[in-house]
């Protein structure tokens, strides 16, 4: 049902869902701080533009009595319960920030007449693709899939002269929320990734993964997994790995690879790490000082959500347009706005675009080095290191199928 919005007469409110079930185990206090920091910036920007308006946030907390798993498994109804709470209190703002869980976002979008924009720090799953009033500020699974297919097909780089068409995917069910949906997308038989590959098998047991590492009869040399180095080591241990195995470790929201004095452990030599390019100043900013390297992006997405709302509010107010309209609700896409740490681009469907970075371990320096970057906005790969010091033979990535000649 329609809920009146606190969104007119020079006073504009943001409804922030503070859900107990969250994509990342970030203390809600940190998210509040991120939102409040965003509000300060927005107020300053509006004031500088000569717009004398009030912008505030209302934090809507879940009671946590029923939906208390802390992760996304019981989030489906929590989001709807919070919406009901907002509805009963007649406290809907101009925009809804949160939820972050794919289950809850999908259900809220499905079960409500959304005449207001939803901004999510998360909602990674394919089921949240192509939603008209949903904006996602953390890389969704679709973007990962497009990178992987692009990279698999690439065969004209000095360090990758073979097209790949096969892969193993390790997915044991203990993944974090982002990894769960990334791997879920790769596993789905109807997904773009599955459609473009000739062979793909999901490894669900540790032993399956461990056996593949030295199995002469393996059907692919490439294994995709999701997590950090510690996660890989816990699984792989000190086991020997065949020389033509390539492990692709998806670890998008982890800035540690770019920090000073980081050296790669020995077990990372057969691994390519896919991560996001860190912000220009985020590593040392006051905002991120109290956040762990894997949580920065989550809190940053909340902060950028506020800045995005401020950007759209400014445009609509300057054009003398109404905020409580379907036009406003559908406007949070196909644009670039000034984020906390530089420009943020949203695609035609409101999903954040970013620069993905593929890292390798230099056998000379034991440092992580950038092999290539990938711009999700234009679906294009840009080689960076034309003569990488790989562990692989001839400093080239091997074929994905042992013994197969040039493609």
């Amino acid at each position: 049902s329609q809920v009146s919005q606190n969104c007119h007469n020079g006073s504009y409110e943001i409804s922030v869902l503070m859900m107990g079930n969250s994509a990342f185990a970030e203390p809600l206090k940190n998210l509040e701080d991120a939102v409040n920091e965003g509000l300060e910036i927005v107020r300053g920007r509006l004031q500088n533009a000569g717009l004398n308006v009030t912008v505030n946030a209302t934090f809507m907390y879940s009671d946590g009595l029923i939906h208390n798993s802390g992760d996304c498994r019981s989030s489906t109804c929590e989001g709807l319960d919070l919406l009901r709470k907002i509805s009963n209190a007649q406290r809907m703002g101009c925009v809804l920030i949160g939820p972050s869980c794919t289950y809850s976002t999908f259900q809220m979008y499905l079960d409500t007449e959304l005449s207001y924009p939803m901004i999510s720090a998360g909602s990674f799953g394919l089921s949240c693709d192509y939603k008209e009033t949903l904006t996602r500020l953390m890389s969704p699974a679709r973007k990962l899939m497009y990178f992987l297919v692009n990279f698999w097909k690439t065969n004209d780089l000095p360090f990758k002269t073979y097209s790949w068409s096969t892969s193993y995917v390790y997915k044991n069910g203990t993944e974090t929320e982002d990894c769960f949906w990334y791997l879920n997308a790769l596993e789905a038989s109807v997904s773009y990734f599955s459609h473009e590959l000739g062979f793909k098998v999901v490894l669900r047991q540790d032993k399956e993964f461990q056996d593949i590492l030295m199995d002469h009869n393996r059907k692919s040399n490439v294994i995709i997994m999701c997590g950090g180095p510690e996660f890989l080591y816990k699984l792989k241990g000190d086991r020997a790995v065949a020389e033509d195995i390539v492990i692709i470790l998806v670890d998008l929201f982890n800035d540690q690879y770019f920090e000073d004095n980081v050296t790669a452990p020995d077990y990372m030599k057969n691994v390519l790490v896919l991560t996001l390019s860190p912000g220009n100043s985020l590593l040392n900013s006051s905002f991120s000082r109290n956040l762990s390297p894997t949580k920065r992006d989550f809190a940053l997405a909340y902060l950028n959500g506020i800045l995005l709302f401020g950007h759209m509010l400014k445009i609509f107010l300057e054009n003398g347009e109404n905020i409580t309209t379907p036009k406003f609700a559908h406007a949070f896409r196909n644009l670039t706005f000034e984020g906390y740490d530089g420009p943020v681009t949203l695609d035609d469907w409101g999903d954040v675009d970013s620069t993905m970075v593929l890292l390798y371990t230099s056998v000379d320096t034991k440092k992580y080095k950038v092999l290539l970057t990938y711009d999700t906005h234009v679906n294009k790969t840009y080689p960076v290191d034309m003569s990488p010091t790989f562990t692989w033979k001839n400093s080239k990535l091997p074929n994905d199928i042992t013994g197969r000649g040039p493609q």
């Epitope: 950090g228 241990g237 000190d238 004095n261 050296t263 452990p265």
Partner: nanobody, 115 residues
Framework: EVQLVESGGGLVQPGGSLRLSCAAS????????VDWYRQAPGKQRELVAG???????TYADAVKGRFTISTDNVKDTVYLQMNSLTPEDTAVYYC?????????WGQGTQVTVSS
Amino acid sequence: EVQLVESGGGLVQPGGSLRLSCAASRNIFSLYRVDWYRQAPGKQRELVAGSTSGGTTTYADAVKGRFTISTDNVKDTVYLQMNSLTPEDTAVYYCHAHDHWRDSWGQGTQVTVSS
């Protein structure tokens, strides 16, 4: 980063034994590997013995059969038991750890083997 403090060095006669200890500032089991290195005057630092949390131990050829590396996960301490010492073992012994992200080094402890 993990802090490492070595102890147990000293003067010992050829054929004697010493046990070096390296106390870590955090859970040793969370580290990828812990190692003992040594540096003799005018020489490069060299790996003496190493142990990974996966249970693999490695030794330099020169110390195999004489030195033993071990860890105590309760005390978060790494030990190097050195037997049948020779003057060639005289060096500063350093504890090293890698926590999956960074290398850390102790200040070193002097071992002198002399009659």
